[in-house]
Interface confidence: low
């Protein structure tokens, strides 16, 4: 059975009294419609709550919104609707909170139909004051802050204009018309696509990719025939239409679009898509959709330039363009990712990688669980995790998997134990070692959150009935205490705690219903008195991450290094505190073949760590097209995995020679496209004749290395079919997080290309 309040569990002394003294109720004096909540800044305690009540009448919509502010982590709220002149705020734009601790907030107001432009309310003092600004355009999207300078804002208008403000929304300037998609890059650079003819939809595949590095004073066209583009880590990706057919393929740039290389990925047709699942400055996880309406595709992992890709996982579940994928970065341990595959029998299974996509395996069966009805063998099965796909299918799964970088090793998720994901009511499972081992933590579905960097886990049962009980654990989910936070149960809508899991406050949101009305209510509980003292050195223990074989000298080595962490002992009931920093001690490992991926023209046979030459390229000089130059590669088949820090040991030879020859893919910069040849026709004829003599040899290599429709076996197959029985492998990637850090809801926006 699940651990709970039994003899083995040491109870926290006098916790009811301590929590009762630190429970703060706030009833919102308005009708319950929808509520959205945002944290303003980090460790400021400032929360903004926007409630909206919408009644669609026959000829118009009646709407009312109210704005509330707390500066004590939600214990008390003040109605500040008068600061925005009691204006109705458009909830679809949300609250645009500035980056870092800028204290900036932008709210977009609903305006009457005939108005010349929209209206925003701006604050730069953590929502203490707001300034009303009328816009010279109607916004189509939420204002986008430059990550480098929160005074710089970007917005698209309903007329497809690209508007920029340099003074935090005070003045706006339209810097370009006919814009489809715009994104901030690094150093206040803006990338955007434009259409020339009809519209974004009509010109899809014929768009141009532009860049401005000076907020619209000057522009550079960096790509043509664009379908879409995306940014990930230091990589800029564009999907580009082929010359001859309706397929498109990925091109990648690492210099903000000045030079491009064709990614060694399969091309996709109109009904398919590419998706950047995760990216950092080292590498990229790319999903390539299968042809047809299969609901799955293939995950590829890139080299450090984003050009060479290794096949990482087949039959990766990703339902449709813009649909659902379970791909999850386990942020509490480097190198760990969890996702789902669609097996041949159409069941869904969970896979995990500990080494940044090198090998995938099933999740180990939890010690305290039995295999369910999906298991053929009652003694052998795996844990399967419910994530976005299950939630989209309206299964009884209230939350996606949860991990936090400062709660080292902890992963919490709903799951079932069998041969595949079950549609039965799931339980909640926890791993304290980054996904290697799992334990059932709670019976049935729950909402859960991590507080104080893992020092406290809080949970609330998912129920259709009103609730008034919260559960908490101070030992990473082994033992649970229950606390009744109100006499009058509420219809629960969500748990809210400050992003970053450093807080000790949790807010329980819900509404109360009386005969005719319902009202929003929040209960904020501060756990500071439960964790009475600050943690000291004696409260921590050394933990070696990714440890699977303590006898092995290389135990814990992932991507060329191992890391020892100071972890809070489960038995210690103390505060990590808001300033807690994860203490880790890295040490470099010797290189082995596992630290290398297969180079151009090489692949890994299944269950083999050696890279062997592709048969069709044997005996050919290996040349490839890079940054528009012909390169000659001397290699014995290996290239170091991005982010791998190993030293010594195995050291394969690798040399790339610039052949000083120009080469192009179908992705021509506008200058090249428009340039006219004024060469003497005779020279052209001679060059043509020379080309004919070498074309046979070159075509063979070009077909496989520099373009054309790629064969699947071209790719370094790290694992053709995920093995259920192999653990090992292990490591690292801090991905560019796609979630809106300050908001109540996750806002996943994987780049679809």
């Amino acid at each position: 059975s699940a651990p709970g309040e039994d003899e083995e569990c040491g109870r926290v002394r006098d916790f009811v009294a301590k929590l009762a003294n630190n429970t703060h109720q706030h009833v919102f004096d308005d009708l319950a419609g929808s509520v959205s909540l945002s944290w303003v800044g980090d460790s400021t305690g400032v929360i903004l709550v926007l409630t909206t009540f919408h009644v669609p009448l026959v000829i118009m919509t009646f709407g009312q919104s109210k704005l509330y502010r707390s500066e004590d982590y939600g214990k008390n709220f003040k109605d500040i609707t008068d600061l925005i002149n009691n204006t109705f705020i458009r909830t679809e734009f949300g609250m645009a909170i500035g980056p870092e601790n800028s204290g900036k907030v932008v709210l977009t107001a609903e305006v009457s139909g005939g108005s010349r432009g929209g209206r925003i309310f701006r604050s730069s003092d953590f929502a203490k004051n707001f300034v009303q600004t009328d816009l010279p355009f109607h916004p189509l999207t939420q204002m986008m802050y430059s990550p480098q300078n929160s005074d710089y804002l970007l917005a698209l208008s309903t007329e497809n204009g690209l508007w920029v403000s340099k003074n935090f929304g005070g003045k706006w300037e339209e810097i370009h018309k006919a814009v489809c998609l715009a994104k901030w890059g690094s150093d206040n650079t803006i990338f955007f696509t434009t259409y020339a003819n009809g519209s974004c939809k009509a010109d899809l595949g014929a768009l141009e990719l532009w860049r401005t590095s000076d907020l619209g004073k000057s522009f550079k066209t960096i790509g043509v025939k664009i379908y879409s583009f995306g940014l990930g880590g230091r990589f800029l990706f564009a999907s580009v239409m082929a010359d001859k057919d309706t397929t498109r393929r990925i091109h990648v740039s690492t210099d903000q679009g000045d030079t491009w290389s064709m990614a060694q990925l399969p091309s996709v047709g109109q009904e398919q898509f590419y998706s950047i699942l995760a990216a950092n400055d080292d590498m990229v996880f790319m999903h390539v959709d299968e042809p047809g309406d299969t609901g799955f595709g293939t995950i590829f992992t890139s080299d450090d330039r984003g050009i060479v890709y290794s096949k990482s996982l087949d039959r990766h579940l990703y339902t449709t363009t813009g649909g659902e994928t379970d791909f999850t970065n386990v942020t509490s341990l480097r190198g760990v990712y969890i996702t789902s595959v669609l097996s041949e029998d159409n069941s869904i299974q969970t896979m995990i990688t500990f080494d940044q996509g090198g090998r995938w395996t099933h999740l180990r069966k939890p010690e305290n669980s039995e295999c369910d009805a999906t298991a053929k063998n009652k003694n052998e099965c795996s844990l399967h995790i419910h994530a976005s796909y299950s939630i989209s299918q309206k299964l009884n799964v209230p939350m996606a998997p949860l991990s936090e970088p400062n709660a080292v090793g902890i992963v919490i998720a709903h799951g079932s134990v069998g041969d595949a994901i079950s549609v039965m009511v799931p339980d909640v499972y926890i791993s304290d070692d980054g996904g290697y081992s799992w334990t059932k933590m709670l019976e049935g579905p729950h909402y859960y959150t991590i507080l104080d960097s893992g020092g406290i886990i809080v949970a609330i049962e998912h129920s259709s009935r009103p609730i008034n009980v919260i559960k908490f654990s101070t030992d990473e989910g082994q033992c649970w205490q229950t606390y009744t936070f109100t006499r009058d149960p509420i219809y629960f809508t969500g748990l809210a705690s400050e992003p970053g899991a450093r807080s000790m406050n949790i807010s329980i949101w819900g509404f109360t219903e009386s005969f005719l009305t319902s009202q929003w209510v929040s209960y904020t509980i501060d756990f500071k008195d439960i964790l009475e003292r600050n943690c000291e050195e004696k409260d921590y223990t050394i933990w070696l991450a990714h440890s699977t074989d303590p006898e092995d000298y290389e135990d814990g080595c992932i991507l060329g290094y191992k890391e020892q962490f100071l972890r809070l002992r489960k038995s210690s009931v103390c505060q990590n505190g808001r300033d807690y920093v994860v203490t880790k001690q890295p040490s470099i490992c010797l290189c082995s073949l596992e630290d290398f991926l297969c180079d151009f023209g090489y692949y890994r046979p299944e269950n083999d760590s050696k890279c062997v030459e592709q048969p069709e390229l044997k005996g050919h000089d290996l040349e490839f097209c890079l940054y528009g130059r012909e390169e000659h590669l001397t290699t014995n088949g290996y290239r170091k995995i991005p982010g791998d820090k190993c030293q010594g040991g195995v050291n394969p030879v690798r040399e790339v020679k610039d052949l000083k020859k120009k080469c192009t893919s179908n992705f021509l910069s506008p200058e090249k496209q428009n340039s006219k040849s004024n060469s003497v026709p005779i020279i052209l004829a001679i060059v043509g004749l020379m080309l004919v003599t070498v074309v046979a040899g070159v075509l063979i290599v070009k077909k496989y290395v520099c373009g054309g429709r790629f064969l699947v076996h071209r790719y370094s197959v790290l694992q053709q079919h995920a093995e259920a029985n192999g653990v090992d492998g292990v490591d690292a990637l801090d991905t560019a997080s796609h979630t809106n850090k300050s908001g109540y809801h996750d806002d996943s926006d994987e780049d679809l290309l």
Partner: antibody, heavy 124, light 107 residues
């Protein structure tokens, strides 16, 4: 209590190198960045660079690039700053200073604990 | 590099006076500005971080304000132990740079 103790004063000839140590105590050494700042006689403060004791990563001011090396020994909670090819205008008091820790920004919140300073005199 | 200009470079004041020191950055540094106090022969001491946050243990008579390019350090009621040199420091962009200092002397 939290403190940084630096090595003693040094007198060096032009062209030589100097290595100043900074021993941390009273806190988890690897959890905070260590900055090095110098102050020439009667002058203001000049930042030289930082080291992340956890990873060994460094960032140096352009002015000192190629001449300065910052290292650390986590086993004894000590940071080191070595300055080579010394010139007479390198005569200064050299300080190590702990970067104030805050979520996200490692440089953004100042230096909250300072060593007592090490006087380096460069003279022929 | 970002230049930090402090003014005045020196000032004379009496115990109990309200003293204001300004610091201007050559470009916007958001609120990544810190203030230090240094007494002769001693290491600097952090007073204010992130433009306006008081470092623990520092008396509340010290306060900081400003964001972007213009910042101010205020000592509401000067005490005998406050006579020292004060430096501002930006930490928005590498390299970190300090102001030239303001020497507060007894009138």
């Amino acid at each position: 209590q939290v403190q940084l103790v630096q090595s003693g004063a040094e007198v060096k000839k032009p062209g030589a190198s100097v290595k100043v140590s900074c021993k941390a105590s009273g806190y988890t050494f690897v959890a905070y960045y260590m900055h090095w700042v110098r102050q020439a006689p009667g002058q203001g403060l000049e930042w030289m660079g930082w080291i992340n004791p956890n990873s060994g990563a460094t960032r140096y001011a352009q002015k000192f690039q190629g001449r300065v090396t910052m290292t650390r020994d986590t086993s004894i909670s000590t940071a080191y700053m070595e300055l080579s090819r010394l010139r007479s205008d390198d005569t200064a008091v050299y300080y190590c200073a702990r970067g104030k820790r805050s979520s996200g920004w490692y440089e953004g919140y100042g230096m909250d604990v300072w060593g007592q300073g090490t006087t380096v005199t460069v003279s022929s | 590099d970002i230049q930090m200009t402090q003014s005045p470079s020196s000032l004379s004041a009496s115990v109990g006076d309200r003293v204001t020191i300004t610091c201007r950055a050559s470009q916007s540094i958001s609120s990544y500005l810190n203030w230090y106090q240094q007494k002769p022969g001693k290491a600097p001491k952090l007073l204010i971080y992130a433009a306006s946050s008081l470092q623990s243990g520092v008396p509340s008579r010290f306060s900081g304000s400003g964001s972007g390019t213009d910042f101010t350090l205020t000592i509401s009621s000067l005490q005998p132990e406050d006579f020292a040199t004060y430096y501002c420091q930006q930490s928005d962009v590498s390299p970190i740079t300090f102001g030239g200092g303001t020497k507060v002397e007894i009138k």
